[in-house]
């Protein structure tokens, strides 16, 4: 059957019908419903929400909706022994204590089970010592401290400001520097935009607001006790000492009122430059320890959280494909929140809900997609992408054979300025073509396309007249699908103006103030940006599931491979003498990229010309497109990161949120001048060039004529 026979309606009409069915008012209603109480992973409230979503997706018309449960390691504060930080005097008396909870927002004073701010998976402990301020606790910040300023963090408690990089990387860096505790805080420089009021009068972070979050370094492992395998009924669990990615030192987050009290007393070295100064009225001295009058005072942490194996629930909905039911297009986003989840994740979950409703409406009218669409409401994303990873581990054999694409659907907004897209190069043309067909919601762009407003506000740094599309990193549920399994993936949301707003993320991220009212009053009163994001995410899913030929352009991969090869070569060429000494050549990589480019070009020509009415040939060509992303997977994984297996992209070793290209070569070259054995270090660079060149060549050959 052709796609049209299977679906009874022309493809163009289908897409229009699907998009027209999406309603801003419904997204608003769903967001309200999902945000009235906390939905922390592992709790009864989040289980009940899973059952509600299951029931509603069934009502919407999906063929089946099941709960998939796993028993994973989670972390919770101790209700009777709260976590806090104190300043103690020489007698050990606590002369200042940080707050035990955030002041609840108006209207939420009587809500129970608001988890107090904590760093999930922190070990228990009560370390005390001198404080060292380490800026953002990035790799380069510790280089500055240790190498330039000769400041030793060993045995110290470090205080770092949130922002720039994933908090887990900050903790890892502090551990490696020998710190015995970490205090994380939100500086107004990063979480308070000038000219905007604090919540509840605006979208800025109040002084008592605190960012929660996990501090794991899982590197894609999923549940720390069952790496590589699902945490099912018969799982064999590692002991806690062998668990993957757990921090070894106590960690706790605070707001800027409390941070002020700790930082105002700091003595020792002055900040090395202005980039180490935030916006508090404190000197931003690095330390160690407090200044003269307060030099006998110390900082003490009191952390009593526990790690517990707890049941989590994914909701998995299926809309069976009419022609290729064994090809899966997946739309997934998480359901669990730190507190109310006004933006993260429920602004995304509400959009998924409306997309499911629209697809269900079409199905009830007799339509089916060509390919199967799977919808997922993931649990325990906030605790390390656990729900999505466990499900993918359980279903890996199906996914690696049948997975066409994964579209992520966490927060729909992090601002209201323009679109932001991160995806595989295979989806660039899909995103461009789709956004040209959608209306822009932006003021001043009435009657213009989304593509036009997006390109104007966020231009590509390389290609004029095109919008910026970024590399996929991690920190969200696409990780296992893209980085481990090699399934083409993408994500889209509305974002802020990065030029004028230098704060990290959005100010109220992971705080109690991330409420429905935050979105409805300050970010998107008409829910027009949510609707646009629904159209982009839903439109991508629709096209991926329904187009006769998969909407992937392999030529775009060729373009970026050349760009990434040029970039990594230029990094290596900062060491021309060593490259000569150790005979380091990138010829094999550039040759492989050239071959890929030529083969991709020929494949694209064949794709235009082949007989689309021949179902065998159609399926063959589509399979070559589907399996191209899979061809970039190295079964052995990256060094010391076995679950990051994509050779072209991986989360940065210095910032989980950021994507790095040719990560194996990049990491081998990183700080190579400081390696004790240069011969061994450059040998590893050569090995990584070999792996990358082989992988690009092997991927190219999957696009060659089959016989």
């Amino acid at each position: 059957k052709s796609s049209n026979e299977a679906t009874n309606i022309t493809p163009k009409h289908n897409m229009k019908a699907f998009l027209d069915e999406l309603k801003a008012e419904n997204i608003k209603k769903f967001l309200y419903n999902f945000t009235q109480i906390p939905h922390l992973a592992g709790t009864e409230q989040n289980f009940q929400l899973a059952k509600q979503i299951q029931s509603q997706w069934k009502e919407f018309g999906l063929d089946s909706v099941e709960l998939a449960h796993y028993d994973v390691l989670l972390s919770y504060p101790n209700k009777t022994h709260p976590n806090y930080i104190s300043i103690i005097n020489e007698d050990g008396n606590e002369i200042f204590n940080t707050s035990l909870f955030e002041p609840p927002p108006p209207g939420y004073e009587n809500v129970s089970d608001i988890v107090p701010p904590f760093s999930a998976f922190s070990p228990q402990g009560m370390p005390e010592g001198d404080l060292v301020y380490v800026n953002y606790a990035r790799t380069e910040d510790f280089f500055k401290l240790e190498r330039d300023m000769k400041i030793n963090c060993s045995g110290k408690i470090v205080i770092a400001r949130y922002g720039k990089v994933f908090r887990g990387n900050k903790v890892k860096n502090a551990q490696l520097a020998g710190a015995k505790g970490v205090i994380l805080y939100s500086d107004p420089a990063d979480y308070f935009a000038p000219g905007v009021k604090s919540y509840p009068d605006g979208w800025n972070l109040p002084g008592g607001g605190v960012q929660r979050g996990n501090i794991l370094n899982l590197n894609g492992a999923g549940d720390p006790l069952t790496p590589g395998y699902p945490a099912n009924e018969y799982a064999y669990r590692r002991g806690i000492a062998e668990a993957v990615g757990l921090p070894s030192i106590p960690v706790h987050p605070i707001g800027y009122y409390d941070a002020q009290k700790l930082l105002e007393k700091m003595g020792g070295s002055a900040p090395p430059d202005s980039s180490w100064r935030g916006s508090l009225k404190v000197p931003y001295n690095v330390g160690p320890g407090f200044t003269g009058n307060f030099s006998t005072q110390k900082v003490k942490m009191h952390i009593h959280s526990t790690n517990e194996v707890t049941r989590i629930y994914n909701v998995i909905g299926t809309l069976r494909g009419a022609v290729e039911p064994d090809r899966y297009v997946i739309l997934g986003g998480h359901r669990d929140s730190w507190v109310f989840g006004g933006i993260d994740p429920q602004s995304g979950a509400a959009v998924v809900h409306e997309i499911v409703r629209s697809f269900g409406t079409l199905k009830k009218e007799g339509w089916r997609p060509r390919r199967t669409i799977l919808f997922a409401s993931w649990d325990a994303e906030e605790f390390g992408l656990l729900g999505s990873t466990e499900w993918a581990e359980e279903n890996s054999r199906l996914l690696q054979e049948r997975g066409v694409a994964y579209i992520n659907a966490d927060s729909s907004i992090e601002g209201n300025y323009t679109l932001r897209v991160d995806c595989t190069p295979l989806m660039y043309s899909l995103v461009h073509n789709l956004t040209k067909e959608l209306k822009s919601p932006d003021e001043g762009f009435e009657g213009k396309s989304l593509y036009e407003s997006w390109t104007k506000k966020s231009p590509s740094p390389e290609f004029s007249g095109m919008p910026r599309i970024s590399k996929l990193g991690s920190g969200n549920d696409f990780e296992v699908f893209f980085q481990r399994l090699g399934i083409a993936s993408g994500r889209a949301r509305y974002t802020k103006n990065w030029e004028t707003n230098k704060f990290s993320g959005y100010p109220l991220y992971h705080s109690v103030y991330e409420t429905y009212e935050l979105v409805e009053k300050f970010y998107d009163p008409m829910f027009k940006y949510h609707l646009t994001v629904a159209q982009v995410r839903g439109g991508m899913v629709f096209e991926l599931a329904n187009s006769i030929v998969l909407p992937f352009d392999c030529r775009d991969y060729a373009v970026v491979l050349r760009k990434y090869a040029d970039k990594i070569y230029s990094i290596s060429m900062k060491h021309p003498q060593e490259m000569k000494t150790y005979s380091v050549s990138f010829d094999s990589l550039f040759s492989a990229v050239k071959n890929f480019t030529e083969i991709a070009s020929k494949f694209s020509e064949r794709l235009q010309d082949f007989d689309k009415s021949n179902p065998i040939v159609l399926r063959m060509m589509n399979d070559q497109l589907m399996f191209l992303e899979r061809a970039f997977i190295d079964p052995l994984g990256l060094p010391d990161r076995p679950f990051y297996r994509h050779v072209i992209y991986a989360p940065s070793s210095h910032n989980k949120y950021a994507g790095e290209s040719f990560p194996g070569i990049y990491d081998a070259l990183f700080d190579i001048e400081s390696k004790v054995d240069p011969s061994k270090a450059w040998g590893e660079v050569k090995r990584q060039i070999y792996v990358a060149a082989f992988t690009v060549q092997a991927a190219a050959e999957t696009l060659s004529e089959v016989a």
């Epitope: 592992g42 709790t43 009864e44 989040n46 289980f47 028993d71 390691l73 989670l74 919770y76 209700k79 009777t80 089970d113 006790l225 009924e233 018969y234 669990r237 806690i240 526990t306 790690n307 517990e308 194996v309 707890t310 049941r311």
Partner: nanobody, 127 residues
Framework: QVQLQESGGGSVQTGGSLRLSCAAS?????FSWIGYFRQAPGKEREG???????????YYADSVKGRFTISRDNTENTISLEMNSLKPEDTGLYYC????????????????????WGQGTQVTVSS
């Protein structure tokens, strides 16, 4: 069918020690928390110590911290409570309780989180 069977109660002098055991039978993989609760004559039942079966995390009542130790042997499906430096106020009927894996109890040491109970074993501490 899931069952919890206690053993090891008895009488002891102040300062003495006892060890309680709780054997879980049936579909024990369904338990997330197992622990001990006690009821002194004329008083309400209270949490003593509980353990997360999957990873061994523990919660203790303040009154027993440092004196009692709860531990698990997953291969034998048993939970043990080692009770040292016993006091007369530790006297009571000690129950083993299990919480099914469903969702996390808001407070793992509160009895309303537990839906499977043993018969109880008597501990008497005399001065």
């Amino acid at each position: 069918q899931v069952q919890l069977q206690e053993s090891g109660g008895g009488s002891v002098q102040t300062g003495g020690s006892l060890r309680l055991s709780c054997a879980a039978s049936g579909y024990t993989a369904s338990f997330s928390w197992i622990g001990y609760f006690r009821q002194a004559p004329g008083k309400e039942r209270e949490g003593v110590a509980v353990i997360n079966v999957g990873v061994g995390s523990t919660y203790y009542a303040d009154s027993v911290k440092g004196r009692f130790t709860i531990s698990r042997d997953n291969t034998e499906n048993t939970i043990s409570l080692e009770m040292n430096s016993l006091k007369p106020e530790d006297t009571g009927l000690y129950y083993c309780a299990g919480s099914l894996r469903w969702s996390r109890p808001p407070n793992p040491i509160s009895e309303d989180a537990y839906n499977y109970w043993g018969q109880g074993t008597q501990v008497t501490v005399s001065s």
